[in-house]
Interface confidence: medium
């Protein structure tokens, strides 16, 4: 028995930040779970982890240098990524595992979300127009 995960197919991070919502076919209320976000087709980089325990405060952390936060819903975890770089444009996969109550459950691999990070472009200010033509 596997948990199903739904993600947006694509998100654009215009300001180098993005909210990625992972929606699960499972209610996480009063569960011990570990939700994680992984970067790359091979999911090689664990971007962010949200660890939930019915008796403790939500723990959110990244061991790979990403600036991330997480928010828990009954059937979802939303990852908020900030300070993304253009070269971090990639496909990102949501994963979930539920350790308690038994049985242990994890998810079917989702289709992932392509996060397209748009660089900050500096537009010329109208106060400083370019040189006027004679």
């Amino acid at each position: 028995n596997k948990i199903l995960v739904k993600q947006s197919p694509m998100l654009v991070a215009y300001d180098n930040a993005v909210n990625l919502s992972c929606k699960y076919s499972y209610n996480l209320f009063s569960r011990e779970f570990r939700a994680s976000l992984h970067k790359g087709l091979d999911s090689a980089v664990e971007v962010c982890v949200v660890y939930g325990n019915y008796s403790q405060q939500l723990q959110v952390y990244s061991k790979t240098g990403f600036n991330c936060d997480g928010k828990l819903g009954n059937e979802s975890v939303t990852f908020y990524l900030q300070n993304l770089y253009v070269n971090q444009t990639d496909i990102y996969f949501c994963k979930i595992e539920v350790m308690y109550p038994p049985p242990y459950l994890d998810n079917e691999k989702s289709n992932g979300t392509i996060i397209h990070v748009k660089g900050k472009h500096l537009c010329p200010s109208p106060l400083f127009p370019g040189p006027s033509k004679p």
């Epitope: 570990r34 660890y51 994963k95 595992e97 350790m99 109550p101 038994p102 049985p103 242990y104 994890d106």
Partner: nanobody, 119 residues
């Protein structure tokens, strides 16, 4: 048939180290949780460490945090318990247990391996 076979127990001096192994067969350890449970005379049974699933989420009893490390090698279908800075109060029979139905209660158990910490 589900089987769990522990090894690695023995006599060790206080402050010493041991590594316990739990070889599983009949199921895949990445599909469940594996726990190390200890039983000592006159003490309550204690789940000292537990590891779950493909991503290897771990949990420890307060009494062993910072001293014991649980790990798993899914390619060998084996779980391990690295025990450092052992104390006399760690003396017990250590059982590997799998597939929880209720919290801290497990369906499948190994035969146990004895750990004695004494000078």
């Amino acid at each position: 048939e589900v089987q769990l076979v522990e090894s690695g127990g023995g006599l060790v001096q206080p402050g010493g180290s041991l590594r316990l192994s739990c070889a599983a067969s009949g199921f895949n350890i990445k599909d469940t949780c594996i726990g190390w449970v200890r039983r000592a005379p006159g003490k309550e049974e204690e789940l000292v460490a537990r590891i779950c699933g493909e991503y290897g989420s771990t949990r420890y009893a307060d009494s062993v945090k910072g001293r014991f490390t649980i790990s798993a090698d899914t390619s060998k279908n084996t779980a391990y318990l690295q025990m450092n800075s052992l104390r006399a109060e760690d003396t017990a029979v250590y059982y590997c247990a799998a597939q929880p139905r209720y919290y801290d209660v497990y369906d499948y158990w190994g035969q146990g391996t004895t750990v004695t910490v004494s000078s």
